[in-house]
Interface confidence: low
């Protein structure tokens, strides 16, 4: 339906609040260095015009593409060449090439510091001076960091945000209160920035296709008493969503994800028994609901696949007829009947019948050619399952630590040049999946350890998309999507690397180790044993962990020493010689 | 919710013409492949003609080549079948359906009945 002026229509449908919110996020995204102050200055100015609009739709200027009139408030910015450099060419482009070019240069790994929590009475004084800003302020914070976080979701982390300092800054003990609950919102925040970069990664380098097959088997899973033309709709309306966060139309797509989320309740019926209470709950804690709802219960009477999709003399005439109706019936078949299995593993197998299908019928016989097609799917079946199965049992003898260790040592064996930050913090998250995971029950540790395991591979994929310095994840990360994680397991010691020569800078370390958290002292020794690694890629696992046993031992001697800064830089030196000799350096 | 409204059938003499149309909605019409079944009195569902969902690819039943012509407007969101020289036989209540052949019907049908 066309409206006379796209900002009004918007604007009425979203609210005040919401319109201004989702702009803020949006600016933000896409000039991510910018002071918070311009940010608002500029929302502001957008603000006013969209209500001039409202109330005069005629008015000038309201009859232009939101692209056009968001595109032309960020050219206005004067510092844009010193600070973003090419990128202000793209204020010479016209819509729709500029807001393109404004994508491309989203940064998914910003060159900015570290947010640094104050103390629990400076943020409930800044809280309580000025709430609007306080929260704004969060908006951008997140949405500079994450520049494709999905934005109707970041409404909802900021509403918790909000109402977690309403309660605990009047509570007995504030810290108490607020420092656990915004662990638990940076967590989940994390991991919800994880997700959607895999989604819009999806969407952008794999096409629309690739994540409408990944949203009809997920919704089959979740879904499985729907019909296949009502999980179509669905997939058809959620990829239109995503497809517009993705692409950096904020409003268009909060105010679609909400008409979903009412279709969605008021066709529960047809849909799921599980949607009830989340449907009962206001708009922006009922979408995130919904997205999260547990699988509905697998109708009981379902019939063998093998009838339609195999043994049916009919099935090159329905795939050729709409090849991917029919392919699109037999993920939805295959998906409600097992919960049990990833997205990605689902995805495979319909790749193999899709496969064999284009094989099978140009053959003599088509149905002898693609009868034993089910066969197939049995060693795609096994592979994850006994990789689950041998990583569940390592994390359970090791710890989520060591796990860790264990994985950042084979992931820089495997693809040695990426950055040691980079393969720090992915192989800290691979690590994850063994206390995400593993204490599921068999039925549901796969869906949970391999789609966890796509979300992460995803961030290693994007961060070494910006500099690529290895054929080896680039080749996985381009090559299918749905293959990215057997891809990298199947990766073996890249023998063509040579070693990083030795530098004791690297191994020097100093006193403020001891004031740093638990977490922030394990990061810098799995900085420490990637090093090691790059140094010396041929060191066996018994001398890589005799070396970090020396490290955790003289981190610990030195913070409880009375001069720390001589112990480090004397023992120091001495763990490094014998680290030298240990691993033959 | 998916709908699919089957409308324009009739009581025609042999040798006569109708156009059936069917208004789909609820779903991403564009994306489907459809079909029209039909079932005569007292017999099961026959497969009639499909379309793939761009309208390139037409199928026919035997029994209505040459007669029949299936066809969609994406932007219309409708399906339709154009009968001509229609002879007794193809007196039944006619369905579309979601799909290729073998689809399921699953709106309220248009009877179409071919007598003198």
């Known amino acids: 339906d066309a409206h006379k002026s796209e900002v009004a229509h918007r604007f009425k449908d979203l609210g005040e609040e919401n319109f201004k919110a989702l702009v803020l996020i949006a600016f933000a995204q896409y000039l991510q260095q910018c002071p918070f102050e311009d940010h608002v200055k500029l929302v502001n100015e957008v603000t006013e015009f969209a209500k001039t609009c409202v109330a005069d739709e005629s008015a000038e200027n309201c009859d232009k593409s939101l692209h056009t009139l968001f595109g032309d408030k960020l050219c206005t910015v004067a510092t844009l060449r010193e600070t973003y450099g090419e990128m202000a060419d793209c204020c010479a482009k016209q819509e729709p090439e500029r807001n393109e070019c404004f994508l491309q240069h989203k940064d998914d790994n910003p060159n900015l510091p570290r947010l640094v929590r104050p103390e629990v009475d400076v943020m409930c004084t800044a809280f309580h001076d000025n709430e609007e800003t306080f929260l704004k302020k969060y908006l951008y914070e997140i949405a500079r960091r994450h520049p494709y976080f999905y934005a109707p979701e970041l409404l909802f982390f900021a509403k918790r945000y909000k109402a977690a300092f309403t309660e605990c800054c009047q509570a007995a003990d504030k810290a108490a209160c607020l420092l656990p609950k915004l662990d638990e919102l940076r967590d989940e925040g994390k991991a919800s920035s994880a997700k959607q970069r895999l989604k819009c990664a999806s969407l952008q380098k794999f096409g629309e296709r690739a994540f409408k097959a990944w949203a009809v088997a997920r919704l089959s899973q979740r879904f499985p008493k729907a019909e296949f033309a009502e999980v179509s709709k669905l997939v058809t309306d959620l990829t239109k969503v995503h497809t517009e966060c993705c692409h950096g139309d904020l409003l268009e797509c909060a105010d679609d994800r909400a008409d979903l989320a009412k279709y969605i309740c008021e066709n529960q019926d047809s849909i799921s028994s599980k949607l009830k209470e989340c449907c009962e709950k206001p708009l922006l804690e009922k979408s995130h609901c919904i997205a999260e709802v547990e699988n509905d219960e697998m109708p009981a009477d379902l019939p063998s696949l093998a009838a339609d999709f195999v043994e049916s003399k009919d099935v090159c005439k329905n795939y050729a007829e709409a090849k991917d109706v029919f392919l699109g019936m037999f993920l939805y078949e295959y998906a409600r009947r097992h919960p049990d299995y990833s997205v990605v593993l689902l995805l495979r197998l319909a790749k193999t019948y899709e496969t064999t299908l284009e094989k099978c019928c140009a053959a003599a016989d088509p149905h002898e050619c693609y009868a034993k097609v089910f066969d197939e799917f049995k060693p795609l079946v096994e592979e994850p399952q006994n990789l689950i199965k041998q990583n569940c049992e390592l994390f359970e003898q090791l710890g989520e630590y060591k796990f860790q260790n264990a994985l950042l040592v084979r992931y820089t064996k495997k693809v040695p040049q990426v950055s040691t930050p980079t393969l720090v913090e992915v192989s800290r998250n691979l690590g994850k999946v063994g206390s995400k995971c593993c204490k599921h029950p068999e039925a549901k540790r796969m869906p949970c350890a391999e789609d966890y395991l796509s979300v992460v591979l995803n961030q290693l994929c994007v961060l070494h998309e910006k500099t690529p310095v290895s054929d080896r994840v680039t080749k996985c990360c381009t090559e299918s999507l749905v293959n990215r994680r057997p891809c990298f397991s199947a990766l073996e010691v890249d023998e063509t690397y040579v070693p990083k020569e030795f530098n004791a800078e690297t191994f020097t370390f100093h006193a403020d180790i001891c004031t740093l958290s638990e977490k922030e002292r394990q990061i810098k020794k799995q900085t420490a044993l990637v090093e090691l690694v790059k140094h010396k890629p041929k060191a066996t696992k018994e001398q890589l962990k005799a070396v970090m046993d020396d490290f955790a031992a003289f981190v610990e001697k030195c913070c409880k020493a009375d001069d720390k800064e001589t112990c480090f830089a004397e023992e120091g030196k001495k763990l490094v010689a014998a680290s030298q000799a240990a691993l033959g350096l | 919710q998916v709908q699919l409204v089957e409308s324009g059938g009739g009581l025609v003499q042999p040798g006569g013409s109708l156009r059936l149309s069917c208004a789909a909605s609820?779903?991403?019409?564009?994306?489907?492949?459809m079909s029209w079944v039909r079932q005569a009195p007292g017999k099961g569902f026959e497969w009639v003609s499909s379309?793939?969902?761009?309208?390139?690819?037409?199928r026919y039943a035997d029994s209505v080549k040459g007669r029949f012509t299936i066809s969609r407007d994406n932007a219309r969101n409708t399906l339709y079948l154009q009968m001509n020289s229609l002879k007794p036989e193809d007196t039944a209540v006619y369905y579309c359906?979601?799909?290729?052949?073998?689809?399921?019907?699953s709106g309220q049908g248009t009877q179409v009945t071919v007598s003198s």
């Open positions: 609820g779903f991403a019409f564009r994306g489907f492949g």
């Open positions: 379309i793939n969902n761009g309208g390139s690819d037409t």
């Open positions: 359906a979601i799909g290729g052949p073998g689809a399921s019907p």
